[in-house]
């Protein structure tokens, strides 16, 4: 999958585009926007009626090296009375997300964009039910 | 800066870290070319927090297309299929990481930016406090 | 701590207007949503209107639709409640409620009233 070329209809390739090898891209990964600090809601992972953990994912030849991932406590889905209700389900919310990976070919190394589908949290649904014959 | 394992029969010159500037290939490497989520699940109408999604488009940012979610009520949909509003309907919010066309317009020179997106919707039970 | 400070209550004939409003001070901060739930006597505290912080979507209760109307002011933290066409159903407690998504906080209450 290519990132597609600057399509005509938006604008011209500006005359202070600096000069890329064929097949490969200029990326700075110094990070925009990385000190900016969001307010997410607090504990929602543990009031939610689809409650989920995080696990932390470290390889030190991605760029970000770490990356969260949240897994669905239970099956089902917490009702009012706190306990878990299996005729809903707990389900996964995921998005992708890019990282640089950096791989190794004996002494030298190159660098490749990868997608990576990050869980991010539940969501309780109902399920779609199908009586088999 | 994030160190990196090194072959111990390479040179010393390399850096263990990340060089602020590197040169990738222009094939994305990736198994999950569906970014559309209204394809990929109908979750956002079957959950108890619904979601509609709206389409945010950026020729300057990579993927230029993303999904942002929007829950549907302020409260939740209970087993009648009425809104429940003694819970909440609240967007999961995550990170993520993009390329902004830097300079502006240039085909093949990116950075790396880092955006909020809503998700999807999960239902919560508030705390409650009576104000005095 | 919180303080929710609700006012625009009172005696109103059949048909007339009231405007309610709550100004939320203290750690109101990272709002969800702000409303208004209200209570008659010898009934369930039911649910009226409320604004979403983030982007101004409103929710109405069937019964109230048409005739009242929710607002907020981001930078007082204050929403309002403009009430017309008052029927005698209308009477009844309301209170202010202010949600930051994860906890959420009920005011004193207001009395409004609507009789002839």
């Known amino acids: 999958r290519k990132i597609p070329k600057v399509g005509h209809t938006f604008f011209q390739k500006p005359e202070s585009c600096p000069p890329v090898p064929g097949g490969s891209m200029k990326l700075d990964i110094g990070i925009i926007n990385e000190n900016q600090r969001v307010s997410m809601s607090r504990n929602i992972e543990s009031r939610s009626t689809s409650p989920w953990n995080y696990t932390v994912t470290w390889d030190p030849n991605r760029y970000p090296s770490e990356v969260v991932q949240a897994q669905c406590r239970n099956l089902g889905c917490i009702n009012a009375q706190g306990k878990e209700d299996i005729s809903m389900n707990s389900v996964p919310i995921q998005q992708e997300t890019l990282v640089v990976r950096r791989k190794h070919q004996g002494c030298s190394v190159s660098f490749q964009l990868e997608k990576v589908l990050v869980t991010v949290g539940c969501t309780c649904v109902t399920p779609v039910i199908h009586h088999v014959q | 800066g994030i160190t990196i394992p090194r072959n111990p029969g390479c040179p010393n010159s390399e850096d263990k870290n990340f060089p602020r500037t590197v040169m990738v290939n222009l094939n994305i490497h990736n198994r999950n070319t569906n970014t559309n989520p209204k394809r990929s699940s109908d979750y956002y109408n079957r959950s108890t927090s619904p979601w509609n999604l709206h389409r945010n488009e950026d020729p300057e940012r990579y993927p230029s297309v993303i999904w942002e979610a929007k829950c549907r009520h302020l409260g939740c949909i209970n087993a009648d299929g009425n809104v429940d509003y003694h819970m909440n309907s609240v967007p999961i919010q995550q990170e993520i990481l993009v390329l902004r066309r830097e300079p502006p317009h240039c085909p093949n020179s990116f950075r790396l930016e880092k955006i909020l997106v809503s998700v999807g919707c999960t239902c919560v039970t508030p705390i409650v406090h009576h104000v005095a | 701590d919180v303080q929710l400070v609700e006012s625009g209550g009172g005696l109103v004939q059949p048909g007339g207007s009231l405007r309610l409003s709550c100004a939320a001070s203290?750690?109101?901060?990272?709002?969800?949503?702000m409303g208004w739930f209200r209570q008659a006597p010898g009934k369930e505290r039911e649910f009226v209107a409320g604004?979403?912080?983030?982007?101004?979507?409103?929710e109405y209760a069937d019964s109230v639709k048409g005739r009242f109307t929710i607002s907020r002011d981001n930078s007082k933290n204050t929403v309002y409640l403009q009430m017309n066409s008052l029927r005698p159903e209308d009477t009844a407690v309301y209170y202010c409620?202010?949600?930051?998504?994860?906890?959420?906080?009920w005011g004193q209450g207001t009395l409004v009233t609507v009789s002839s």
């Open positions: 409620v202010l949600d930051l998504s994860t906890v959420r906080y």
């Open positions: 203290g750690r109101a901060s990272s709002i969800n949503w």
């Open positions: 604004i979403r912080w983030s982007d101004a979507y409103t």
